[in-house]
Interface confidence: low
Amino acid sequence: KRFHDVLGNERPSAYMREHNQLNGWSSDENDWNEKLYPVWKRGDMRWKNSWKGGRVQAVLTSDSPALVGSNITFVVNLVFPRCQKEDANGNIVYEKNCRNEAGLSADPYVYNWTAWSEDSDGENGTGQSHHNVFPDGKPFPHHPGWRRWNFVYVFHTLGQYFQKLGRCSVRVSVNTANVTLGPQLMEVTVYRRHGRAYVPIAQVKDVYVVTDQIPVFVTMSQKNDRNSSDETFLKDLPITFDVLIHDPSHFLNYSTINYKWSFGDNTGLFVSINHTVNHTYVLNGTFSLNLTVKAAAPGPCPPPPPPPPRPPKPTPSLGPAGDNPLGLSEIPDENCQINRYGHFQATITIVEGILEVNIIQTTDVLMLVPGPDSSLIDFVVTCQGSIPTEVCTIISDPTCEITQNAVCSPVDVDEMCLLTVRRAFNGSGTYCVNLTLGDDTSLALTSTLISVPDRDPASSLRMAN
């Protein structure tokens, strides 16, 4: 059998195979050693008994999408049946005090591979044997502690395969410079040691994407905005737009990145080299936000231009001394750059909101018959922007960390936005008061520290003012 017979039904065209050469990978036309690595079709009854105590699940993830030319990383994690785990020596053991369907196990081992490998029958003096090989016959690499690695992972994509010896989690990175754009399929088959052979325990596949567009995400936030995820924001307050570029392999780390914004409100194009910008909308309405990200990324070199008919006359330099301005080195012929772009578009709605809230006065309310330990305090509050419909107060300790009391109530405020909020305080001392005014779309906060004095029993007949 050949690798492609074993590893998947997806057969790439000859063109795909030729143009998607992955560095360090081998052609799936190679022969597969079925004697050491048996092949079971999906639904074969032997899968049921391939692992003691249940089925092993392989979880394959990748950091796709990948910008062409960058590295994409695949991670396979093995999930063992309940109560089983891999120990420091690579053996599979039962977790202490963990009860599964079979109850508590007396034998600590599910698979004691250390004992198996100590039985070195058939090995030559180098520690290598006919069974310490991959499915294509290549010998296992002898890393320190390689004997503790008891799983063989075979990755398969684009008509090529990659073999890796590992523990219950492995990672493989692939450079995408030669990968065709679009969605591709990665398939992984996992084998475990079984004496001097291997047994398949799991198969998994996942789609990954290679793109020539920079993957771009934008987070939008604004002070006083009640719900940051609804793409509705407030007029006359700056919105912070933060651009996140999905570049897990840091391919663009040394690239120069440029952000071109159009906020859709006739303010023109805003061009920045910073990934964070602020913009204030001064009108209500719906606006189309557009961002183009440009990066000069490493890329293939164009063919050299034909030589000029004759050399140009040398001319004196007009620039300042120093041939490496601004720390940007000239690009040598073999290290060319290509422009890559990313795009983001969103429709945002701008509405009136509460822009600011201020406590302009606090007054101790004098009561005719004061409670034994209670004080009433009036907070005179003003606001700017839209008219609030609710007020909330949170009374806490002087550090503003331990909440003692929280009260919300509807309010009816005139257009001047001047209101009085009365709150009770139990006992004297210093309190932190967070006062929030809200409406459907906004929430504006102000804080103050107040001192409530001791009640003088002799002044119990003070009139309320």
């Epitope: 120069t256 620039g319 300042p320 750059q337």
Partner: antibody, heavy 120, light 107 residues
């Protein structure tokens, strides 16, 4: 040797057009912005716009819309500014200046300038 | 457009004097400010980029600082060859805009 070579002087009639070249040498032409800046006699500097030869992307000063058009010819490493419907207000020295992609307005090398005189 | 207000317009100083020029942006431009020197009959030359970074080959008597809206440019000890017009320029917002210039003359 890094250079931005501009033509010396252009005398043109009102209403006509002029196309000013800026020939770059000694650096990776496609990987830097090329800016154009106007300076009227005894006056300050006015940024007209910039073009990225790698892909022809431009950023323009809206004030010069309809007046200035920026182009490049990558085969000859030359940037051009075309000024149309010329009036006496367009009489000035026009500089080309490059800037790195990541510091797109920090113009680190300048041409010697082309003087344009609009006169009948 | 961002307006860059540069002061003073004119400076008459003696060799060895310390000189400071200020530039105020009409709104925040982060640290994306450059300073240029233009000697009589010549093209402008870049002295400072990103508000405070001295360009290759620029003598260390030229320094600058600032962030947001307020920027300063200093020549610690003026020399005769510093006779020139100095411009600030913001390159945060497009269109990029220059200050009106400061003419430095030596007594």
């Amino acid at each position: 040797q890094l250079q931005l070579q501009q033509s010396g002087t252009e005398v043109v009639k009102p209403g006509a057009s002029v196309k000013i070249p800026c020939k770059a040498s000694g650096y990776a032409f496609s990987s830097y912005w090329m800016n154009w800046v106007k300076q009227r006699p005894g006056k300050g500097l006015e940024w007209i716009g910039q073009i990225y030869p790698g892909d022809g992307d431009t950023n323009d000063n809206g004030k010069f819309e309809g007046k200035a058009t920026l182009t490049v010819d990558k085969s000859s490493n030359t940037a051009y500014i075309q000024l149309s419907s010329l009036t006496s207000e367009d009489s000035a020295v026009y500089f080309c200046a490059r800037s790195p992609l990541h510091l797109r307005g920090s113009m680190d090398y300048w041409g010697q300038g082309t003087s344009v005189t609009v006169s009948s | 457009s961002i307006v860059m207000t540069q002061t003073p317009k004119f400076l008459l100083v003696s060799a060895g004097d310390r000189v400071t020029i200020t530039c105020k942006a009409s709104q925040s431009v982060s640290n994306d400010v450059a300073w240029f020197q233009q000697k009589p009959g010549q093209s402008p030359e870049l002295l400072i980029y990103s508000a405070s970074n001295r360009y290759t080959g620029v003598p260390d008597r030229f320094t600058a600082s600032g962030y947001g809206t307020d920027f300063t440019f200093t020549i610690s000890a003026v020399q005769a060859e510093d006779l020139a017009v100095y411009f600030c320029q913001q390159n945060y917002y497009s269109p990029f805009t220059f200050g009106g210039g400061t003419r430095l003359e030596i007594k």
